[in-house]
């Protein structure tokens, strides 16, 4: 039989499906797959779901460059551009479109659960009410192209279909142990007790990084994460905010010890010589092991929040290291200078 009847469906909000692996719960962040380490290379755009970037966004790529060096296998070819967010994972910015709530409809109507969104930081450009959570750093679709145009997405280098190994390369000024030693030995004041020093940027209790500088984050191909535990703890630590599909991952006891080494060195790497104030600083490569997959399937509603490090994990781990990896040496100008130089060097590299 020819399906000629008009197919009308209605919704509370246009496209407010939630993501995740629990029934009717929305809003996980980041795209990866739980089965092995496939994915992150192809974007949701490639599968034709999620937000619709404008040609300007696709070409100019209002996309924040990833700050990590991706080492990955080659992926399948495509004529769609690929982009990654600052966390090295693929992202998508969802337009804040929302259709007015519908009334009772036909039997085949698909109703989509409405979400009560918090006010977005960025005003929607689509002229519709905001659809979901805080979108700082994301932009809505740009102006439509010329009606009827058939321009294709510019071709960019093929992304990986495998989960890239992310390595943050930390370049520090060439170490000269002797020079560093001599500088430190001239310190006129005794070294401060590092255990009680607060970081320049803030102690780990206040370490809350919320990336917001990116513009349009385009997620590559949606992928599946339905059974993976969160990077920062078990599912018990994932708190769903019904208001917008936004998930804040809270970790009460986040132990970085076996996954992260500080850029300049944790206290484990600082040897205190009582007499001479001699400090040995070992610079390590910052390595994040991707041993925990993030939780999202195709996701269109991607709002990434870095885990909050609440409370001191242990006085040995990060308590003396600032969020930039520098050590607060307020009472030691020489060491502070060295730390500042390292920080400046890192800053030059965008780290």
């Amino acid at each position: 039989a020819e399906p000629r009847q008009e197919f009308e469906v209605m919704e509370d909000h246009a496209g407010t499906y939630g993501l995740g692996d629990r029934k009717d719960q929305g809003g996980y962040t980041m795209h990866q797959d739980q089965e092995g380490d496939t994915d992150a290379g192809l974007k949701a755009e490639e599968a034709g779901i999620g937000d619709t970037p404008s040609l300007e966004d696709e070409a100019a790529g209002h996309v924040t460059q990833a700050r990590m060096v991706s080492k990955s296998k080659d992926g399948t070819g495509s004529d769609d551009k690929k982009a990654k967010g600052a966390d090295g994972k693929t992202k998508i910015a969802t337009p804040r479109g929302a259709a007015p709530p519908g009334q009772k409809g036909q039997a085949n109507a698909t109703r989509i659960p409405a979400k009560t969104p918090p006010a977005p930081k960025t005003p929607p450009s689509s002229g519709e009410p905001p659809k979901s959570g805080d979108r700082s750093g994301y932009s809505s679709p740009g102006s439509p192209g010329t009606p009827g145009s058939r321009s294709r997405t510019p071709s960019l280098p093929t992304p990986p279909t495998r989960e890239p190994k992310k390595v943050a390369v930390v370049r520090t000024p060439p170490k000269s142990p002797s020079s560093a030693k001599s500088r430190l030995q001239t310190a006129p004041v005794p070294m401060p007790d590092l255990k009680n020093v607060k970081s320049k940027i803030g102690s780990t209790e206040n370490l809350k990084h919320q990336p917001g500088g990116g513009k349009v984050q385009i997620v590559y191909k949606p992928v599946d994460l339905s059974k993976v535990t969160s990077k920062c703890g078990s599912l018990g630590n994932i708190h769903h905010k019904p208001g917008g599909g936004q998930v804040e991952v809270k970790s009460e006891k986040l132990d970085f010890k076996d996954r992260v080494q500080s850029k300049i060195g944790s206290l484990d790497n600082i040897t205190h010589v009582p007499g001479g104030g001699n400090k040995k600083i070992e610079t390590h490569k910052l390595t994040f092991r991707e041993n925990a997959k993030a939780k999202t399937d195709h996701g269109a509603e991607i709002v990434y929040k870095s885990p909050v490090v609440s409370g001191d994990t242990s006085p040995r781990h990060l308590s003396n290291v600032s969020s930039t990896g520098s050590i607060d040496m307020v009472d030691s100008p020489q060491l502070a200078t060295l730390a500042d130089e390292v920080s400046a060097s890192l800053a030059k590299q965008g780290l």
């Epitope: 919704e11 092995g36 994915d39 034709g48 779901i49 619709t52 679709p141 321009s151």
Partner: antibody
Amino acid sequence: QVNLRESGAEVKKPGASVKVSCKVSGYTFTGYYMHWVRQAPGQGLEWMGWINSNSGATKYAQKFQGRVTMTRDTSITTAYMELSSLRSDDTAVYYCARGARDGYGFDYWGQGTLVTVLA
Amino acid sequence: SYVLTQPPSASGTPGQRVTISCSGGSSNIGSNAVSWYQQLPGTAPKLLIFTNDQRPSGVPDRFSGSKSGTSAPLAISGLQSEDESDYYCATWDDSLNGWVFGGGTKVTVRS
């Protein structure tokens, strides 16, 4: 309410072209991808490709490369799918389907357009 | 032939539980989320399950999806006569660079 309304049935001869339209209402047209899926009589569903309603960028299934053209007119919130060099096995119901934005799938479908290719 | 494999038919009596399998490979189900569609005779498909196990509002909770490895079954518990329909699974395929569907499963409710 979201509504995808497709054009009426078409009868074509082999070698001809057909252009099916999908008029959209109830949501921001440019905020979603539009996919085209076809279904031959008594057969399953077959994905043909998508068009980014905002930018006009397209992606086509390998099988239809060179024969299909997807366009859209944002001023009238309508997407089009044109299939050329028609063959008898192109006889099918052609559906437009909206790509979900916050989930993985096609959340709304048009009612379908039957295209019959007769020798 | 279809990239995703579904049984051509499945049946049950009212109140029974019916499970429809959908199997694929590492490039599709193994690495991407699955959606399910219900197509009543003579109508367009309707989204039934998205992102493996999510139900759009309005879809009865008798329908449940899951995914394990390269297989993604759809379960219908408490089968009802109105569930008599064709069911299709779909996902993105990394290798084919396109969406792929299963061949469809016709569910019959025996009275």
